[in-house]
């Protein structure tokens, strides 16, 4: 976990101001509206069954 303005989050994660910690970009498939997802290169689309089982 990083404070803003210090070393960046590790590869595959992005800083969340809302949660005040680095978060896994992989979470953006499930929670695409999360603030940290803006810092993730590309959030892969969820499999059909995860979104609409």
């Amino acid at each position: 976990e990083q404070a803003p303005g210090t070393a960046p989050c590790s590869r595959g994660s992005s800083w969340s101001a809302d949660l005040d910690k680095c978060m896994d970009c992989a979470s953006c498939r499930a929670r695409p509206k999360s603030d940290f997802c803006l810092g993730c290169a590309a959030a892969p689309p969820a499999p059909f069954r995860l979104l609409w089982p």
Partner: antibody, heavy 119, light 111 residues
Framework: EVKLEESGGGLVQPGGSMKLSCVAS????????MSWVRQSPEKGLEWLAE??????????HYAESVKGKFTISRDDSKSRLYLQMNNLRAENTGIYYC??????????WGQGTTLTVSS | DIVLTQSPASLTVSLGQRATISCRAS??????????MQWYQQRPGQPPKLLIK???NLDSGVPARFSGSGSGTDFTLNIHPVEEEDAATYYC?????????FGGGTKLEIK
């Protein structure tokens, strides 16, 4: 400190009903997906049901084995999670865990409450 | 449903040595970028505890002697060096789709 505390377990006869409850503290309950997971010697760990956020219109998802029998619900104002279980059978015996996750994993677990279905 | 098969069912490892636990999924749980596989530790009488999410990412507070690897259908949890407190049952869990499922568990004993 994160805490999830289940209650409502006990002994129930086959065909009976039971409602489990879980009270959460130490994290932002209304920003977490919540689930119930059962553990039994026969079937190990089984995910049963999930409820998402208000922004998801409290979408719910169920394992096929409990669909139509179990109902998950939440009360964000009380930081509480519920599981209404109807038409219980012996195979529903086990430890029921209340779990919370920011996304599609289980960050936080309660200590569990034991349900025994037997005549 | 995706079936997760763990191996071995149990293993005994000497203190300070390496423990390797495998989890095989009945279909791929990975995209080109991420793998949707978690690992949990359950000590006797306790609930499971999240160790690793998305195949490789240690949860906060988890010691660096735990590591996860793999993609597609084959995943591995490594513990090195093993400590006495690592005696527990370890489970994998996928989040590729609903229903989420768990592996049958691997019981680790320390000698």
């Amino acid at each position: 400190e994160v805490k999830l505390e289940e209650s409502g377990g006990g002994l129930v006869q086959p065909g009976g009903s039971m409602k489990l409850s879980c009270v959460a503290s130490g994290f932002t309950f209304n920003n977490y997906w919540m689930s119930w997971v059962r553990q039994s010697p026969e079937k190990g760990l089984e995910w049963l049901a999930e409820i998402r956020l208000k922004s998801d219109n409290y979408a719910t998802h169920y394992a096929e084995s409990v669909k139509g029998k179990f109902t998950i619900s939440r009360d964000d104002s009380k930081s509480r999670l519920y599981l209404q279980m109807n038409n219980l059978r012996a195979e529903n015996t086990g430890i029921y865990y209340c779990t919370g996750g920011f996304a599609d994993y289980f960050d936080y677990w309660g200590q569990g409450t034991t349900l025994t279905v037997s005549s | 449903d995706i079936v997760l098969t763990q191996s071995p069912a149990s293993l005994t490892v000497s203190l300070g040595q390496r423990a390797t636990i495998s989890c095989r999924a009945s279909q791929s749980v990975s995209t080109s970028s991420y793998s949707y596989m978690q690992w949990y530790q359950q000590r006797p009488g306790q609930p499971p505890k999240l160790l690793i999410k998305y195949a490789t990412n240690l949860d906060s507070g988890v010691p660096a002697r735990f590591s996860g690897s793999g993609s597609g259908t084959d995943f591995t949890l490594n513990i090195h060096p093993v400590e006495e407190e690592d005696a527990a049952t370890y489970y994998c869990q996928h989040s590729w789709e609903i229903p989420y499922t768990f592996g049958g568990g691997t019981k680790l004993e320390i000698k």
